[in-house]
């Protein structure tokens, strides 16, 4: 996990809101885990950030990500008049200048340091899932959500006409 | 443009049975989760039921008050979502709307015209 | 369940002032550090229409003078300049928990 005290005392001045040049709705500093109560964690190797799913020891911190929340407009607009209705988008930050990226290419979830405006792969639609549980839609890849492969985070395309549990792709939100 | 329309209302007597549908178009209806909401002057707006995706393996949530006589179902190759309602009361009489959340599943923002159930002797 | 409590449950308002509207919750809404609280605005013999989502996000097409704010169990919905076609009645709902509930409605006229 991040060995940087500033994590914790996370705060919006640690953020300028013009992503995108919009301002977010809000933001939520939480840790976030799975549907199975692992964590998600991060990690600084060789000067760059890794990201593992975890089960934490008993007094172990849980590391925290700031979601900035944005509303958008749906991406199909399917209707043409604006009544798909609007989105919601987050970002995730689990320190300073370091977003959430999906690789496309690889299929992969990374750190990446990046200035504003962010790049669209940054950007995720939250999905509501009962159980207190969300999932995070790939802007840029709609079907593609971050989800949980090998103790990593990576890209799953999931196929909405197909019967298929979803747990994998579930992620918990908690302030503690 | 899309649509919400519901059919199958009309009058029933206590105990009896009744089936709602609601047929959409102008989206892809298999994207969305459905509800069914009812309006009464007694009660005002009440939610009563929905049901998510097939990846969500079709799972239903119902009101307390409708749990066990309500059910709740969908044939996205038909673009419709239906209430199996059983059983029914006096006070199960209103305005019947079909509804659909949003992208992502937030809140309502479609909305059917409703279909009205009469429940008397 | 979470029961919302509008207030007034009618009010008259002159045209181009400002009409404010109050639902209070029983327990809070908030989720995932975002208010689960939307209003509606319905016509007589028509279904509801979404003006706000999530406490303060406008509905689409949704005109600027409506606006949401609050958090937690108390919440305003706010319209000025109300117009003339502003006459409704207006319903808080949360979608926070399983059941969904809706608030009692407050009846606006324009005087």
């Known amino acids: 996990a991040f060995g940087i005290s500033g994590v914790q005392k996370y705060t919006r001045a640690l953020h300028d809101s013009s992503i995108t040049g919009i301002s977010p709705i809000t933001e939520y500093l939480a840790s976030l885990s799975t549907y199975n109560d692992q964590s998600i964690t991060f990690a600084l190797e060789d000067e760059s950030y890794e990201i593992y799913v975890e089960d934490l020891k008993k007094d172990e911190k849980k590391d925290k990500v700031l979601l900035s929340y944005y509303e958008s407009q749906h991406p199909s607009n399917e209707s043409g008049d604006g009544v798909d209705g609007k989105m919601l988008m987050v970002t995730l930050s689990p320190t300073k200048d370091f977003w959430l990226h999906a690789n496309n290419k690889e299929h992969s979830v990374e750190l990446h340091k990046c200035e504003k405006p962010l790049p669209d792969q940054a950007f995720f639609v939250l999905h509501n899932m009962h159980s207190n549980c969300v999932s995070f839609e790939c802007k840029t890849d709609p079907g593609v959500f971050i989800g949980v492969k090998d103790n990593h985070l990576a890209l799953i395309k999931v196929d909405s006409s197909e019967n298929l549990c979803t747990e994998n792709i579930l992620f918990k939100l908690s302030e503690t | 443009e899309v649509k919400l329309e519901e059919s199958g209302g009309g009058l029933v007597q206590p105990g009896g049975s009744m089936k709602l549908s609601c047929v959409a178009s102008?989206?892809?209806?298999?994207?969305?989760?459905m509800n069914w909401v009812r309006q009464s002057p007694e009660k005002g707006l009440e939610w009563m039921a929905e049901?998510?995706?097939?990846?969500?393996?079709?799972?239903?949530h119902y009101a307390e008050s409708v749990k066990g006589r309500f059910s709740i179902s969908r044939d996205d190759s038909k673009s419709t979502v239906y209430l199996q309602m059983n059983n029914l009361r006096a006070e199960d009489t209103g305005i019947y709307y079909c509804?659909?959340?949003?992208?992502?599943?937030?809140?309502?923002?479609?909305w059917g015209a409703g279909t009205t159930v009469t429940v008397s002797s | 369940d979470i029961v919302l409590t509008q207030s007034p449950t009618s009010l008259a308002v002159s045209l181009g002032q400002r009409a404010t509207i109050s639902c209070r919750a029983s327990?809070?809404?908030?989720?995932?550090?975002?208010?689960?609280l939307n209003w509606f605005q319905q016509k007589p013999g028509q279904p509801p229409k979404l003006l706000i989502f999530?406490?303060?996000s406008q509905g689409s097409g949704v005109p600027a003078r409506f606006s949401g704010s609050g958090s937690g169990t108390d919440f305003s919905l706010n319209i000025h300049p109300v117009e003339e076609d502003d006459t409704a009645m207006y319903f808080c709902?949360?979608?926070?928990?399983?059941?969904?509930?809706f608030g009692g409605g407050t009846k606006l006229e324009i005087k």
């Open positions: 999530v406490a303060s």
């Open positions: 327990e809070s809404v908030d989720k995932f550090g975002m208010s689960f």
């Open positions: 709902q949360q979608s926070k928990d399983i059941p969904y509930t």
């Open positions: 102008g989206f892809t209806f298999s994207n969305y989760w």
């Open positions: 049901i998510t995706l097939k990846f969500n393996n079709y799972s239903t």
């Open positions: 509804a659909r959340r949003n992208y992502g599943d937030w809140y309502i923002n479609v």
